[in-house]
Interface confidence: low
């Protein structure tokens, strides 16, 4: 029988009455248009809702927006449009919410054509009050907060000026002209590219990369012939045009651009691209597009300096047209990533890695599912996950895969079971062990969200018809109860819960439609009375992550250590609570060859843990460019995986010698780099 209909599914007692007492409806006094919602701060309960409605007139479009505020997680809303003088807010800039719990909000207003500059409304008290500020420029982008100091803002103007504010948008200063792209780095540093000959597009590949560490008092040119740049973890990347042709290469810096090394990655041509898929302080996943319009490329994983790369996955799906990739970091278990490959027959298959890109495999077939018609062998097939690509292709997939760091091991995703992704209506699958095993959780597409750190999963069926039913599970998706939250169905538009999955409140957004009007409506349901008591020690059980063979002494070892977690028992119906902290006990493992990636010039044959020399490099000295000097690499083919904590055991030798020879990348060498002050 389907999940949730088994006899052993324990019913949550009197849940209808409990939920009915905790269901709060709010009808917004608005014509439909569009709605956007932002949470202000963490655990504050403050939500801002901006509704906008465009009335097309003969000559122009008349816009109206309203601003609403809740301070009880969406149960009640107050119209605060008067705090922003009933001004029309530009939705394309969204609501710029400050980092952490700064309580800062910036709204960008629509201004009339002839005005000297734009207008913003600023709040630093969680949107209780707003200050109107007229800008000396027209903003092109949303205001960007410095991650270190929420009083520091930067923005680009429509005339490509780089503007900075040091007092949360009160006063603005243009610190540079002709700027294409600007980003905050660490320590309030700003990196930006500039053009010399007319425009960003015209100068692509001839841009300069600049840095300011003092908010525009002084500058340093840290790169030339730049195509683009990006930041990931502690790495600064730039793609740089080659001297002789139209190809470009990735250069990397770990010291904010003072010194650069050429990454050991293939160069790319005009039609190709590089993409940083994921990065942390240890390493980076880099996608390198294949020549031609193939829709795929190769994933490489870096060493701890971001310089030497190992091939991780071939034929990685990444469309050039829509820029879609299914690459997903499974945040509920360390080392796990899921993505899609485009196989030779053009079908799309899902792959998973449990060791940060060292090995990729297919997802195990769920126990309670059969292989579909894409499977050659009806008894052997895999689960294939729908993610961004399927959504872009307008398949019936309302949501991407979901995982939360504090809901350990839980992954929820739409998928199909066969040899490749199927275009049939997908079902929803859940893994409770970070992707090792899967179970069909719900039939057909659903919206889903995780509450109370995994203590509750909520789902709503994806339907073109109006809905009035929500489903919830208190046992990680094994059994489901349904609750009718309103007598009159609504056209559903989205589920909203506080980021971080610690809340017990869920808001269901939609609109009601009558003959004459349609209005926005939200229903906020608080599940606190379903989970009546706080969880105690007896409600948790010890779980070894990445466990595949309990008999093996090294069972659970991933990246050199294993972790035991305290996890809520599926049978326990209790509150983890807002202050819940994941309890884990790590222990170091002995090193094995699995703890090493293949070094530059080496590769791992399929199903082999040994690294062998690349045939084309056999007998050659391994030399590469590092910080503008040529280095000689003495290696037996292995290097420690970044972030791997193993000790003892296998210990392959690796040594890098400085050859004292100059080698140039296309960057200015450090001693020639120029600085200037304002």
């Amino acid at each position: 029988s389907a999940p949730g209909e088994d006899e052993e599914c324990g019913r949550v007692r009197d849940f209808v009455a409990k939920l009915a007492n905790n269901t709060h409806q709010h009808v917004f006094d608005d014509l439909r248009g569009s709605v956007s919602l932002s949470w202000v701060g963490d655990s504050t309960g403050v939500i801002l809702v901006l509704t906008t409605f465009h009335v097309p007139l003969v000559i122009m479009t008349f816009g109206q927006s309203k601003l609403y505020r809740s301070e009880d997680y969406g149960k009640n809303f107050k119209d605060i449009t008067d705090l922003i003088n009933n001004t029309f807010i530009r939705t394309e800039f969204g609501m710029a919410i400050g980092p952490e719990n700064s309580g800062k909000v910036v709204l960008t207003a629509e201004v009339s054509g002839g005005s000297r500059g734009g207008r913003i409304f600023r709040s630093s008290d969680f949107a209780k009050n707003f200050v109107q500020t007229d800008l000396p420029f027209h903003p092109l982008t949303q205001m960007m907060y410095s991650p270190q100091n929420s009083d520091y803002l930067l923005a680009l103007s429509t005339e490509n000026g780089l503007w900075v504010s040091k007092n949360f948008g009160g006063k603005w200063e243009e610190i540079h002209k002709a700027v294409c792209l600007a980003k905050w780095g660490s320590d309030n540093t700003i990196f930006f590219t500039t053009y010399a000959n007319g425009s960003c597009k015209a100068d692509l590949g001839a841009l300069e990369l600049w840095r300011t560490s003092d908010l525009g008092k002084s500058f340093k040119t840290i790169g030339v012939k730049i195509y683009s740049f990006g930041l990931g973890g502690r790495f600064l990347f730039a793609s740089v045009m080659a001297d002789k042709d139209t190809t470009r290469r990735i250069h990397v810096s770990t010291d904010q651009g003072d010194t650069w090394s050429m990454a050991q990655l293939p160069s790319v041509g005009q039609e190709q691209f590089y993409s940083i898929l994921a990065a942390n302080d240890d390493m980076v996943f880099m996608h390198v597009d294949e020549p031609g319009d193939t829709g795929f490329g190769t994933i490489f994983t870096s060493d701890d300096r971001g310089i030497v790369y190992s091939k991780s996955l071939d034929r990685h799906l990444y469309t050039t047209t829509g820029g879609e990739t299914d690459f997903t970091n499974v945040t509920s278990l360390r080392g796990v990533y899921i993505t899609s490959v485009l196989s030779e027959d053009n079908s799309i298959q899902t792959m998973i890695t449990f060791d940060q890109g060292g090995r990729w495999t297919h997802l195990r077939k769920p126990e309670n599912s059969e292989c579909d018609a894409t499977a050659k062998n009806k008894n052997e097939c895999s689960l294939h996950i729908h993610a961004s690509y399927s959504i872009s292709q307008k398949l019936n997939v309302p949501m991407a895969p979901l995982s939360e760091p504090n809901a350990v091991g839980i992954v929820i995703a739409h998928g199909s079971v066969g040899d490749a992704i199927s275009v049939m209506v997908p079902d929803v699958y859940i893994s409770d062990d970070g992707g090792y095993s899967w179970t069909k959780m719900l039939e057909g597409p659903h919206y889903y969200t995780i509450l109370d750190s995994g203590g509750i999963i909520v789902a709503i069926e994806h339907s073109s018809r109006p809905i009035n039913v929500i489903k919830f599970s208190t046992d990680e998706g094994q059994c489901w109860q349904t609750y009718t939250f309103t007598r009159d169905p609504i056209y559903f538009t989205g589920l909203a819960s506080e980021p971080g999955a610690r809340s017990m409140n869920i808001s269901i957004w939609g609109f009601t439609e009558s003959f004459l009007t349609s209005q926005w409506v939200s229903y906020t349901i608080d599940f606190k009375d379903i989970l009546e008591r706080n969880c105690e020690e007896k409600d948790y059980t010890i779980w070894l992550a990445h466990s595949t063979d309990p008999e093996d002494y090294e069972d659970g070892c991933i990246l050199g250590y294993k972790e035991q977690f305290l996890r809520l028992r599926k049978s326990s119906v209790c509150q983890n609570g807002r202050d819940y902290v994941v309890t884990k006990q790590p222990s170091i493992c002995l090193c094995s060859l699995e703890d090493f990636l293949c070094d530059f010039g080496y590769y791992r044959p399929e199903n082999d843990s040994k690294c062998v020399e690349q045939p084309e490099l056999k007998g050659h000295d391994l030399e590469f460019c590092l910080y503008g000097r040529e280095e000689h690499l003495t290696t037996n083919g292995y290097r420690k995986i970044p972030g791997d904590k193993c000790q003892g055991g296998v210990n392959p030798v690796r040594e890098v010698k400085d050859l004292k020879k100059k080698c140039t990348s296309n960057f200015l060498s450090p001693e020639k780099q120029n600085s200037k002050s304002n």
Partner: antibody
């Protein structure tokens, strides 16, 4: 062995109704999508309707929407097609087929429906 | 809706011949295509799914190829039992999952 056996075909007056059944055996019925396909005499195959494994999702070509209804009873391993407001152009052999994804992998022997006065 | 154009509509061939039937689709269907065989008075039988994969029990003289918008069913050496009508069908995106109009393969 997978088996699909259709029944319920026969002569029906224009404007009349008919309910076709398909009995499934030899496989786990409740995890497969199912479809109906028809074939008018001397003509090609025409897809009629599809239903998801749990019966939640149903699909029809636009020209048949509103007149035809596909349904299933997983407890009885049975698939149904309710035909209303019969027209002469509905005269065909109606096949039920197992539809797990990118193909219809097993078909019944078909049942003939004739709409005529 | 996706349009399917199957060609030829009929063809005569002899035992031992190599025969090719094509199916052209109005947009990229990413290999989501099936081929069926139907003999007179019988129900259709699945031959190939996902453009290139042979269904269980189908002789290896049958093969499917193609990607994007152009797909082919090939019979490498025609046998007497292969004379039948062949249909392609797409399964891309949302319904309708249209069939091609069919190719009747007759004995020369």
């Amino acid at each position: 062995e997978v088996q699909l056996v259709e029944s319920g075909g026969g002569l029906v007056q224009p404007g009349g109704s008919l309910r076709l059944s398909c009995a499934a055996s030899g496989f786990t019925f409740n995890i497969y999508g199912m479809s109906w396909v028809r074939q008018a005499p001397g003509k090609g195959l025409e897809w009629v309707a599809t239903i998801s494994s749990g019966g939640i999702y149903t699909y029809y070509p636009d020209i048949l929407k509103g007149r035809f209804t596909i349904s299933r009873d997983n407890a009885k391993n049975s698939l149904y097609l309710q035909m209303n407001s019969g027209r002469a152009e509905d005269t065909a052999v109606y096949y039920c087929a197992r539809h797990p994804g990118g193909a219809m992998d097993y078909w019944g022997q078909g049942t003939l429906v004739t709409v005529s006065s | 809706d996706i349009q399917m154009t199957q060609s030829p509509s009929s063809l005569s061939a002899s035992v031992g011949d190599r025969v090719t039937i094509t199916c052209r689709v109005s947009e990229n269907i990413y290999s989501n295509l099936a081929w069926y065989q139907q003999k007179p008075g019988k129900s259709p039988k699945l031959l190939v799914y996902a453009a290139t994969n042979l269904a269980d029990g189908v002789p290896s003289r049958f093969s499917g190829s193609g990607s994007g918008t152009d797909y082919t069913l090939t019979i490498s050496s025609l046998q007497p039992e292969d004379f039948a009508t062949y249909y392609c069908q797409h399964f891309w995106g949302t319904p309708p999952w249209t069939f091609g109009q069919g190719t009747k393969l007759e004995i020369k």
